[in-house]
Amino acid sequence: LTCLGGFASPGPVPPSTALRELIEELVNITQNQKAPLCNGSMVWSINLTAGMYCAALESLINVSGCSAIYRTQRILHGLCPHKVSAGQFSSLHVRDTKIEVAQFVKDLLLHLKKLFREGQFN
């Protein structure tokens, strides 16, 4: 189980709810968006496999000063079972490939929707 929302959270949030919340937030920040997200910041690409939430957080946590993804980072914190800090890298990063935050978010979103449809919430 994961806990989202910081001190305001009433209790543990089921993974399916957390995943829905993440999907909805990623849609919010990308809908009809053509301007570069986070001023075109680049992040490490990740393998969209097991451990993806932590890997995604490890990539996005290195983007600073971008309010558009603050809530995404917070939701990912709730979905990742261990503490993640800037500069941390897991084997799930494709270390030789950097992509724009906007593309990273869109790729992540499409994959999360696929997982949700397949009922893979963890």
Partner: antibody
Framework: EVQLVESGGGLVKPGGSLRLSCAAS????????MSWVRQAPGKGLEWVGR??????????NYAAPVKGRFTISRDDSKNTLYLQMNSLKTEDTAVYYC?????????????????WGQGTLVTVSS | SYELTQPPSVSVSPGQTARITCSGD??????AYWYQQKSGQAPVLVIY???KRPSGIPERFSGSSSGTMATLTISGAQVEDEADYYC???????????FGGGTKLTVL
């Protein structure tokens, strides 16, 4: 065949209510964001509101003139979109179209595809 | 509330290039969509995401966007292109749609 068919239009008195339906076929309705757009006689197109697909949150947004009076909903099991219109005003008189929402096209499986209904006329008059 | 501004009318001779503009403060960051509507018919999408053309739309239709202005260009306009054209986009949140007032294209 990909199509949308609206129904439920007609004559209603000011202050009255009406529910429009839009039956979808030929595409994966549950993946689509859907919009309602209206056109008053001899006037331009006016965006009424939209509903996201369920997987994208199912959230609704409305244009200022209809917010609080109109409600958009969907029944994916019936491939049907609805527009519940309450507290109708004479200025709501228009042809109402349902359409796939292009902003949501990236998230669905209808990217670059455009589907509109034939429109249904709603007349608000005493 | 957010608005998109279009010229009420544009006239060209057959074979000429017609340009219809659409201005809006959010257009630098939000995509524009263009619809063609002929009398008594439902609108038809002719350009999406600023410059992409749906299948079945003739190549003479193209779109571009720069700053707060989106432009629909019809190269070698034909009589059958005579119609009302509407630009469509969203406010800066992406949550609320808006249409321009429409431009009547006359090809004579």
């Amino acid at each position: 065949e990909v199509q949308l068919v609206e129904s439920g239009g007609g004559l209603v008195k000011p202050g009255g209510s009406l529910r429009l339906s839009c039956a979808a076929s030929g595409f994966t309705f549950s993946n689509a964001w859907m919009s309602w757009v209206r056109q008053a006689p001899g006037k331009g197109l006016e965006w009424v509101g939209r509903i996201r697909s369920e997987i994208d949150g199912g959230t609704t947004n409305y244009a200022a003139p209809v917010k609080g009076r109109f409600t958009i909903s969907r029944d994916d099991s019936k491939n049907t979109l609805y527009l519940q219109m309450n507290s109708l005003k004479t200025e709501d008189t228009a042809v109402y179209y349902c359409a796939t929402d292009q902003v949501g096209a990236y998230y669905g499986d209808y990217y670059g595809m455009d589907v509109w209904g034939q429109g249904t006329l709603v007349t608000v008059s005493s | 509330s957010y608005e998109l501004t279009q010229p009420p009318s544009v006239s060209v001779s057959p074979g000429q290039t017609a340009r219809i503009t659409c201005s809006g403060d959010a257009l630098p960051e939000k995509y524009a969509y263009w619809y063609q509507q002929k009398s008594g018919q439902a609108p038809v999408l002719v350009i999406y995401e600023d410059s992409k053309r749906p299948s079945g739309i003739p190549e003479r239709f193209s779109g571009s966007s720069s700053g707060t202005m989106a432009t629909l260009t019809i190269s070698g306009a034909q009589v059958e292109d005579e119609a009302d054209y509407y630009c469509h986009s969203t406010d800066s949140s992406g949550n609320h749609g808006v249409f321009g007032g429409g431009t009547k294209l006359t090809v004579l």
